[in-house]
């Protein structure tokens, strides 16, 4: 059994590490990976009452 | 829209093992996290764990020595073993899948298991 | 294991008034600028629907009468006005550290 990749991370870790391009940091273990591996929050309807979230999972130029 | 189903037996004697399926339409299960959580009797959740995109697997330690999930991405299924039960786990049993946060958006409609000789 | 104590364990509100839920988490769910903090509504015989995520972005298809607040370890759900189709139990749940876990739980009635 392998455990998550996060449960080595202490509270006091880096900012995120610049992805390559075409990659996506993975909040949810720390580290980049194809941005085609993760899934984002549903976009909301046109006219939704707040607007949509800033995502911090876009890919680094 | 993606959409989860669990499904698997409703009766389970005493340490014996729990399998579990979870089937995963309007997504593939190499993208993104796929989650089993149980609800108890009384009213409390609980993170079991996970599989990732990779087939990377999280487990939560109260749980490590006696579970496993696994994936088969042929089936576009991923699967739910808990080993040596008892009538603790006696529980509702929801495969889940998270979006960016780790905020689950889609849930299966639950499976009852009932742990009993 | 980050503790999520929610209060009040349960909680009857008139219809049209405002139902305030508190969640506090045993150390910061914060990272990156993230509060990995997330409510959720849960009926009988149903599964839990996502209503919050990251504190206080509104799921979609939620209705604007839902509201997230908070960072650190101090987060409130707030439902204004409440209707009737809101008696349920509602969860916090934080995704910050592993294992990610869950609040016990508010139970929302109608006074």
């Known amino acids: 059994m392998r455990r998550g990749p996060r449960s080595l991370r202490g509270r006091d870790a880096p900012a995120p590490t610049p992805c390559v391009p075409a990659e996506c940091f993975d909040l949810l273990v720390r580290h980049c990976v194809a941005c085609g591996a993760l899934r984002t929050p549903r976009p909301k309807p046109a006219g939704a009452s707040s607007p949509a979230p800033r995502t911090a999972l876009q890919p680094q130029e | 829209e993606v959409q989860l189903q669990e499904s698997g037996p409703s009766l389970v004697k005493p340490s014996q093992t729990l399998s579990l399926t979870c089937s995963v339409t309007?997504?593939?299960?190499?993208?993104?996290?796929w989650n089993w959580i149980r609800k108890f009797p009384g009213n409390k959740l609980e993170f079991m764990g996970y599989?990732?995109?990779?087939?990377?697997?999280y487990y939560n330690p109260s749980l490590k020595s006696r579970i496993s999930i696994t994936r088969d991405t042929s089936k576009n299924q991923y699967y739910l073993q808990l080993n040596s039960v008892t009538t603790e786990d006696t529980a509702t049993y929801y495969c889940?899948?998270?979006?960016?946060?780790?905020?689950?958006?889609?849930w299966g409609q639950g499976t009852t298991l009932t742990v009993s000789a | 294991d980050i503790v999520l104590t929610q209060s009040p364990v349960s909680l009857a509100v008139s219809l049209g008034q405002r139902a305030t839920i508190s969640c506090r988490a045993s150390?910061?769910?914060?990272?990156?600028?993230?509060?990995?903090m997330h409510w959720y509504q849960q009926k009988p015989g149903q599964p839990p629907k996502l209503l919050i995520y990251r504190a206080s972005d509104l799921e979609s298809g939620i209705p604007a009468r839902f509201s997230g607040s908070g960072s650190g370890t101090d987060f409130t759900l707030t439902i204004n006005p409440v209707e009737t189709d809101d008696v349920a139990i509602y969860y916090c749940?934080?995704?910050?550290?592993?294992?990610?876990?869950f609040g016990g739980g508010t139970k929302l009635e109608i006074k």
């Open positions: 150390e910061s769910v914060d990272d990156y600028g993230i509060s990995f």
């Open positions: 749940q934080q995704t910050s550290k592993d294992p990610w876990t």
């Open positions: 309007g997504d593939s299960i190499t993208r993104g996290y």
């Open positions: 599989i990732n995109y990779s087939g990377t697997t």
């Open positions: 889940a899948t998270p979006h960016t946060y780790g905020a689950m958006d889609y």
